[in-house]
């Protein structure tokens, strides 16, 4: 058992153009609050699926009114952490949905209006007991900065909160299914793995793979109450001390209600009282409808008139995801050819072409030599997206306009002397050497 904790640091307009100044208007003040939904494993973060690890709702933040003309401040946030308790092992990998809700405060008579402002989702690996992890997520034009961690509640410890630890000072007899704790303070050993299906409430083991029953229970998995007819109670095993029935397994044993729902027995079965935001026989459904505005970035919500029917977001170009919350990285498809630079402007793609190329996708190879003359008898050579001049002897530079000193590079070997000549260069070789460059 343990607690997942979420700390919201800031919520506001993200970087870049087109970001809203504020979620509130000067006409209608508002305040923000947050809802977090956790699911085990790297499951799809569909908002409709149940928050099997739990959910939490923050308090409402301070009232905020936009001041026209004033610089946009950080939006005031609710105080405190969002805490999601978990009863079983921490899964290590989990999916989250964090919703930012706006409560618009109308006049006294009209009351507030609630609307979903942004929803971010993600999948993460996280060991319990570790430090705070920081994250930044964007939903459309909004940016949410937050930190999170999972911590175990004593006596659970370990990265999954599955190791149970009893301090040395505690009584040495550990509970059923637990090995005695190690001698050092707060060190402990993992519970034995009993036979698969062995009742966690009524069975225990002292050797791996066995299933021994507590008093009043029987069967290979300790799920069958020992029957007795001497008492009035309709079910349950007999107590060795009283001879009377003690409560046995009821329909609420193990709490069939998900997402923090509370179970109450009924004459025929059980009934779950669900926390806010959940419904269904076992509180397994989280209802989000088109009325909640789940489609971001101008997505069109279809269906989902009520929480029983799923909604579908039809995303505008450039966005994807079940809520149109993900911007498509259109540049990842490398649409610009010939080494062009891709720019995703949001409403359109632009390619910045290298010299010598043109077109929306830099697909046209320009005639690099068109309109370009090489001086002093040089000839233009096309290629590589830029023109190049092959210059006549005695000339150099980009357009062959510079007079070149052919002797500057000291081309004559073995001490030969270089003379510039209208047709090139001539080497006068030192005694004993010959060849155009005195190389022999």
């Amino acid at each position: 058992a343990g607690v997942f904790e979420l700390q919201i640091h800031s919520f506001g307009p993200g970087p870049g153009p087109g970001a809203p100044r504020s979620p509130c208007s000067a006409r209608l003040p508002c305040r923000l609050f947050f809802r977090v939904c956790l699911k085990p494993g790297l499951s799809e973060e569909a908002a409709e699926s149940p928050c099997a690890l739990g959910a939490a709702l923050s308090a409402r933040g301070p009232v905020y009114t936009e001041q026209p003309g004033a610089p946009a401040p950080d939006l005031p946030l609710p105080d405190g952490l969002l805490q999601v308790p978990f009863r079983d092992a921490w899964p290590g990998t989990f999916s989250f949905i964090i919703e930012t809700w706006r409560e618009e405060l109308g006049d006294q008579i009209g009351g507030p209006a609630w609307s979903l402002l942004a929803r971010v989702a993600g999948r993460r690996r996280l060991a319990a007991g570790g430090p705070w992890a920081r994250d930044i997520q964007r939903a459309g034009a909004w940016e949410l900065r937050f930190s999170y961690r999972a911590r175990c509640e004593p006596p659970a410890v370990g990265t999954a909160c599955t190791r149970l630890c009893r301090p040395r000072s505690a009584p040495s007899r550990c509970g059923p299914g637990l090995r005695p704790c190690a001698p050092l303070e707060d060190e402990c050993e993992a519970p034995l793995v009993c036979r698969a299906g062995c009742s966690p409430e009524h069975g225990f083991c002292e050797q791996p793979g066995e299933c021994r029953c507590l008093e009043g229970w029987t069967g290979p998995l300790c799920t069958v109450p020992v029957s007795t007819s001497s008492c009035l109670s309709p079910r349950g095993p007999s107590s060795a001390t009283t001879g009377c029935l003690v409560p046995g397994p009821g329909p609420c044993d193990g709490n069939p209600c998900a997402n923090g729902g509370s179970c109450s027995e009924t004459p025929r079965s059980f009934e779950c009282t669900c926390p806010r935001g959940f419904y269904g026989l076992r509180c397994e459904v989280s209802g989000v409808t088109c009325a909640d505005g789940p489609c971001f970035n101008g997505g069109l919500c279809v269906g989902g008139a009520d929480p029983d029917s799923a909604y579908i977001c039809h995303c505008p170009p450039g966005f994807q995801g079940s809520n149109c919350e993900k911007r498509v990285d259109r540049c990842s498809l490398q649409p610009c050819r010939n080494g062009g630079l891709c720019l995703d402007l949001g409403h359109a793609l632009r390619c910045r072409c290298r010299a010598g190329f043109a077109g929306p996708r830099c697909e046209h190879d320009l005639d690099d030599c068109a309109g370009r003359a090489c001086a002093n008898g040089g000839t233009c050579v096309e290629g590589g997206g830029a023109h190049r001049c092959s210059c006549a002897l005695g000339f150099g530079g980009r357009d062959c306009r510079e007079r070149a000193d052919p002797c500057a590079a000291r081309p004559c070997a073995h001490g030969g002397r270089c003379y510039a000549h209208f047709s090139g260069l001539v080497c006068a070789c030192a005694p004993g050497y010959m060849g155009a460059r005195c190389e022999f």
């Epitope: 809700w101 507030p112 209006a113 609630w114 959940f278 009325a291």
Partner: nanobody, 123 residues
């Protein structure tokens, strides 16, 4: 399509209590704004209390604050209005409404309405 049916109204003495119920069928009540309105003869319909069932957020008219409590039971698909310390001026037909994108006490914003249940408070 949501069908809303109110019940629990009746005649009581001033200072008495009632529990009004709004049972929804055809859809679940979860994750939507719902409200109780009332209309006395010759008067306009006024908002009494509202709740966002997905969030548990509530709001009350000043005239009923501290006396009325709105709540929900998702398992029963029902929204309740517990009315205590009733006064003669609380006499009205009480209506339940669901689904609004506008401020939750604005009657014109709601899509679904029940037929109402009468509350009469005598002095």
């Amino acid at each position: 399509q949501v069908k809303l049916v109110e019940s629990g109204g009746g005649s009581v003495q001033a200072g008495g209590s009632l529990r009004l119920s709004c049972a929804a069928s055809g859809s679940t009540i979860s994750s939507r704004p719902m409200a109780w309105f009332r209309q006395a003869p010759g008067k306009e319909r006024e908002g009494v209390a509202c709740i966002h069932t997905g969030l548990g957020r509530t709001y009350y008219a000043d005239s009923v604050k501290g006396r009325f409590t709105i709540s929900q039971d998702n398992a029963k698909n029902t929204v309740y209005l517990q009315v205590n310390s009733l006064k003669p001026e609380d006499t009205a037909m009480y209506y339940c409404a669901a689904d609004s994108r506008r401020p939750c006490m604005v009657a014109a914003g709601y899509t679904y309405w029940g037929q109402g249940t009468q509350v009469t408070v005598s002095s």
